[in-house]
Amino acid sequence: SGVFQLQLQEFVNERGVLASGRPCEPGCRTFFRVCLKHFQAVVSPGPCTFGSVSTPVLGTNSFAVRDDSSGGGRNPLQLPFNFTWPGTFSLIIEAWHAPGDDLRPEALPPDALISKIAIQGSLAVGQNWLLDEQTSTLTRLRYSYRVICSDNYYGDNCSRLCKKRNDHFGHYVCQPDGNLSCLPGWTGEYCQQPICLSGCHEQNGYCSKPAECLCRPGWQGRLCNECIPHNGCRHGTCSTPWQCTCDEGWGGLFCDQDLNYCTHHSPCKNGATCSNSGQRSYTCTCRPGYTGVDCELELSECDSNPCRNGGSCKDQEDGYHCLCPPGYYGLHCEHSTLSCADSPCFNGGSCRERNQGASYACECPPNFTGSNCEKKVDRCTSNPCANGGQCLNRGPSRMCRCRPGFTGTYCERHVSDCARNPCAHGGTCHDLESGLMCTCPAGFSGRRCEVRTSIDACASSPCFNRATCYTDLSTDTFVCNCPYGFVGSRCEFPVGLPPS
């Protein structure tokens, strides 16, 4: 689609005569008829296949034609066409005399023709005007012409349609040859694809407008190169999306189990030493003078029963003091002024003379001790119970009452979390530092294999292209959660993503 433009410049008819040689009365009031048609080696009459146009009266006898002539005419004359310009043409220009105001062909006498010229040849589309002058015996016509494309048409023959746009369907202007020239920030065949923020990750990122970087699910950050940990993750990170790799001191599927209770909670009081002993469990080793699971209780100096031979103990600011019974003396009432004659041995103890009767020694029956067999044996004085266990005297023996999670005569063994068979439906239990883990048989899942899942439809790895597989519990079938760029029940078909 384009326009053949004809610019009339000057017409000379000095004698003011018609083609027949007869003069015009009073002068030749001149107008033009133009016929544009396909190329003919010999231009013949016939339909104006490329179009025709007439002018109003432009002047009398000889005159110059101004651009955009007044009187309703247009100069240059426009002959539009809506086909591919063939590159060749034929042009007929007729000058006519108008005796009256009616310029219609049927209203004019045939002898009103002043002159007729015909040219033909090649003409390329372009902005440059071709200047021409045609002379007959009595007249001369100077004119120029060219072919240009209509708005939105481009190319050598005005056949390429291109309309600049800046909307959802494209962001471009048109080059002279009709090719698209993308606006800044856009690319692709029709300039529909935005150029993302520089550095935006090719797989993990995309954009809907230039200089943007939006992340696909599982990725975060300015350039979408940082993964997002699992939704339930607490104290863990990831190297690929939805992972939960535990920080030091944390365990469990979601890194929510505290393996470093000592550091995170500092449970031991009064300067005690804390030792981690499994998930959420710890042991406090108390400094002298303190007791309790968390060493929270202050010991009295007299609690260790330092006074012997029935001496009574009194707490003092700087320690303790022993009040000795008659016949004894010393810091701990350990020295005696008695002999066997004074029957110093209690609880059935037998007395033996020493140093020629100057002193004695008591041999105590079972369960009694002390210089005079005055004390019941306390088998707990050596703190034999480990891991915070409580020591209890039971007649001639002792026993340890263990804290949860420990067993053995001295609470020395960590109870296996698996001992109570926590895994349901035949699950296999594994003792881990972070707690127990159940390996479930086919058809069961959950932390304790408590969830019936019938069969693991994902066992055969049916999903392609790194899709995530889930078992649909209602149908015992698998469901593939496709990554971006793939569709299909097994994520087997690639697609362009993301659709806008």
Epitope: S208, L214, C215, R216, P217, G218, W219, Q220, G221, R222, E226, I228, P229, N231, G232, C233, R234, H235, G236, T237, C238, D247, T468, Y470, D472, V479, N481, C482, Y484, V487, P498, P499
Partner: antibody, heavy 118, light 107 residues
Framework: EVQLVESGGGLVQPGGSLRLSCAAS????????MAWVRQAPGKGLEWVAT????????NYRDSVKGRFTISRDNAKNSLYLQMNSLRAEDTAVYYC???????????WGQGTLVTVSS | DIQMTQSPSSLSASVGDRVTITCRAS??????LAWYQQKPGKSPKLLIF???VLADGVPSRFSGSGSGTDSTLTISSLQPEDFATYYC?????????FGQGTKLEIK
């Protein structure tokens, strides 16, 4: 236990400013993207803004761009929303949530009410 | 923006009933869909993500399914504590968008 506690809501005049805060605990804050989601009285949920974990890159819904600023202090385990040029249509309960624009919001705070009225 | 349309907007049911709520996206969202439960005066709680994966601590009576543009939340046997408003959310496309909500009331 994951806990998100919002504060800073209140009554403000149109054109005014407000700064919301969210104190996070129970998870390693710096690893996780965070978001603000709002709910106008009697209406549904509407995403407002998100910020990534360590590089702190923000994204906003179109209606708040240029007026709201989301930020975080990973050392203090805190998330913030600076709201300027407030309008009546910004009136809502604002929730702090753990999540991103391309992931579910796994944990939510109790919300703080922002009322914009003259 | 992607439009998320929930149906029904409200629904009455009794304890023990099986209930289904549907969410339709204005275009394919590739299973990137979550469901939330919200009780009056409380914050939303994540129930299901990736269309069918149960969030930690959510009872197994809740389940999700769907593909393409249509997704469904099913509660197999309603309990008294399940009466609330439920929202769906897509997170495939930016910005993330929520459904208008479905209010589940006691009959």
């Amino acid at each position: 236990e994951v806990q998100l506690v919002e504060s800073g809501g209140g009554l403000v005049q149109p054109g005014g400013s407000l700064r919301l805060s969210c104190a996070a605990s129970g998870f390693t804050f710096r690893y996780f993207p965070m978001a603000w989601v709002r709910q106008a009285p009697g209406k549904g949920l509407e995403w407002v803004a998100t910020i990534s974990g360590s590089d702190e890159w923000p994204n906003y819904r179109d209606s708040v761009k240029g007026r709201f600023t989301i930020s975080r202090d990973n050392a203090k385990n805190s998330l913030y929303l600076q709201m300027n040029s407030l309008r009546a249509e910004d009136t809502a309960v604002y929730y702090c949530a753990r999540g991103y624009y391309n992931s579910p919001f796994a944990f939510w705070g109790q919300g703080t009410l922002v009322t914009v009225s003259s | 923006d992607i439009q998320m349309t929930q149906s029904p907007s409200s629904l009455s049911a009794s304890v023990g009933d099986r209930v289904t709520i549907t969410c339709r996206a204005s275009q394919e969202i590739y299973r990137n869909l979550a469901w939330y439960q919200q009780k009056p005066g409380k914050s939303p709680k994540l129930l299901i993500f990736d269309t069918s994966v149960l969030a930690d601590g959510v009872p197994s009576r809740f389940s999700g399914s769907g593909s393409g543009t249509d997704s469904t939340l099913t509660i197999s046997s309603l309990q008294p504590e399940d009466f609330a408003t439920y929202y769906c959310q897509q997170y495939t496309y930016y910005p993330p968008t929520f459904g208008q909500g479905t209010k589940l009331e006691i009959k």
